[in-house]
């Protein structure tokens, strides 16, 4: 039960995280005009990964796409790449994790296959989250650097006579969405990896439980008649015996070929 919950929760958390990464990537407010101690512009500037926008005091907003690839800063290209890789990995991870969910039955898929898929999706979520966090952090660092550069030179002289307004930019909402989303995806991935450990069937026989019958001893192993096959059939974590035998979740099995009492 705990494994299923962990897996399900990991999936949901990752789903929210990836939705957040997609939202952050598409948002225009990666950087917003700093309004503190700045020349008061009648328009409000903000920029995203794909376009820059201006909101006029009337509420009218106009955006212009970055219609160049070569003319863009390398750092911006890197951030775009990190976010896209994060989305792609996250999307694949979600697809894989859907089939890996314990509550979903697909044919006669073995538990070992589900465990592997859970682990794979978990790793994908972790990498996806890290990509998003890295992308957002690189952009934030770029902003901080530019902010202090423009603060040092609030007005850049043009020909010594004409001044041009140096608009300073600060952290936009998308950065915070990206950090939170990346963190959630990362947490979801870790949860999937933890769930994978609980899903993986044991390769070894379980610790035997000894029952003393009248006259002679017979050792039973949890898992019914298939106990000798190495894979217990008790995959539903239900009690097989009423005589005090414990479930797989309750008994930890350690590598020992014959552990009879």
């Amino acid at each position: 039960m705990a494994v299923t919950a962990c897996q399900g929760l990991g999936f949901v958390v990752s789903l929210i995280g990836i939705a957040g990464i997609i939202a952050a990537t598409c948002m225009d407010q990666w950087s917003t005009q700093d309004l503190y101690n700045n020349p008061v512009t009648a328009v409000f500037n903000y920029q995203g990964l794909w376009r820059s926008c201006v909101r006029e005091s009337s509420g009218f907003t106009e955006c212009r796409g970055y219609f160049t690839l070569l003319g863009l800063p390398a750092m911006l290209q890197a951030v775009r790449a990190l976010m896209i890789v994060g989305i792609v990995l996250g999307a694949i991870g979600l697809l894989v994790s859907i089939f890996a969910l314990k509550c979903i039955r697909i044919g006669s898929m073995e538990d070992s296959a589900k465990a592997n898929m859970t682990l794979t999706s978990g790793i994908m979520f972790i990498v996806s989250g890290l990509c998003a966090i890295a992308g957002v952090s690189v952009f934030a660092n770029m902003l901080v650097t530019n902010f202090w550069m423009s603060t040092a030179n609030m007005y850049t002289g043009m020909g010594g006579m004409v001044q041009t307004v140096q608009t300073r930019y600060t952290f936009g909402a998308a950065l915070f969405v990206g950090w939170v989303a990346g963190g959630l995806t990362l947490i979801g991935g870790v949860m999937m990896c933890i769930a994978c450990r609980g899903l993986a069937p044991e390769e070894t026989n379980y610790k035997a439980v000894s029952y003393h019958a009248s006259g002679h001893s017979v050792a039973y192993k949890p898992g019914g008649f298939k106990a000798s096959t190495g894979f217990g059939s008790n995959t539903k974590n239900k009690k097989i015996y009423d005589g005090g035998a414990r479930t797989e979740d309750e008994v930890q099995s350690y590598p020992s070929k014959h552990d009879y009492v």
Epitope: V40, V43, V54, S58, V165
Partner: antibody, heavy 119, light 113 residues
């Protein structure tokens, strides 16, 4: 039809106060920022103040800062300019102007009200 | 504050003639966010309030005759009347609508010879 009608102008002594009003009709007043612009007799235009639609942003010309206060009542479709510590150089025709939807332009102007500051 | 300087102060032209007037700002009025120049042109006829002609430096307000056109970017702007008509006699003002306080040029007076 968009209409802006200023009132409240007149003769006032230096150091005195005056409150200008602007009654608006023909558009959704609460959706637009508004400006006050003045023009001294025979001189050019001088921007005085701006108030945003929701009163969150208010800006003044340096020459009137601390003396003039712009306000609005969206329920009454009215714009106001409270003028205190008036000086002779404040003598002008005061226009109530709507801030346009595009390009930060001042698109509709009232006919103006004359304020004369003289002893 | 941004200083707006218009030239010439006045000009007299014949009917049908092409006329250009200039406006120079002490700071750039160009917004990189939307690639627009926040400069507006107004026409004020004697005894009337000003009328909006052009915004974004080159976009004509609806109802304004197409003989009026605006151009320029950054700090240097021009208003052109391709063929002056009698009704164009007025004072023309340019305005910075990019940075507060918003500032007007001193105006260019257009007269007919």
């Amino acid at each position: 039809e968009v209409q802006l009608v200023e009132s409240g102008g007149g003769l006032v002594q230096p150091g005195g106060s005056l409150r200008l009003s602007c009654a608006v009709s023909g558009f959704t007043f609460s959706s637009f920022g508004m400006h006050w612009v003045r023009q001294a007799p025979g001189k050019g235009l001088e921007w005085v103040a701006y108030i945003s639609s929701g009163t969150t942003n208010i800006y003044y010309a340096d020459s009137v800062k601390g003396r003039f206060t712009v306000s609005r009542d969206n329920a009454k479709n009215s714009l106001y300019l409270q003028m205190n510590s008036l000086r002779a150089e404040d003598t002008a025709v005061y226009y109530c102007v709507r801030s346009g939807y595009y390009g930060q332009s001042l698109d509709y102007w009232g006919q103006g009200t004359l304020v004369t500051v003289s002893s | 504050d941004i200083v707006m300087t218009q030239s010439p102060d006045s000009l007299a032209v014949s009917l049908g003639e092409r006329v250009t007037m200039n406006c120079k700002s002490s700071q750039s009025l160009f917004s990189s966010g939307n690639q627009r120049n926040y400069l507006t042109w107004y026409q004020q006829k004697p005894g009337q309030p000003p009328k909006l002609l052009i915004y974004w430096a080159s976009t004509r307000e609806s109802g304004v005759p197409d003989r009026f056109s605006g151009s320029g970017s950054g700090t240097d702007f021009t208003l052109t009347i391709s063929s002056v008509q009698a009704e164009d006699v007025a004072v023309y003002y340019c305005q910075n609508v990019y940075i507060y306080p918003l500032t007007f040029g001193q105006g260019t007076k257009l007269e007919i010879k």
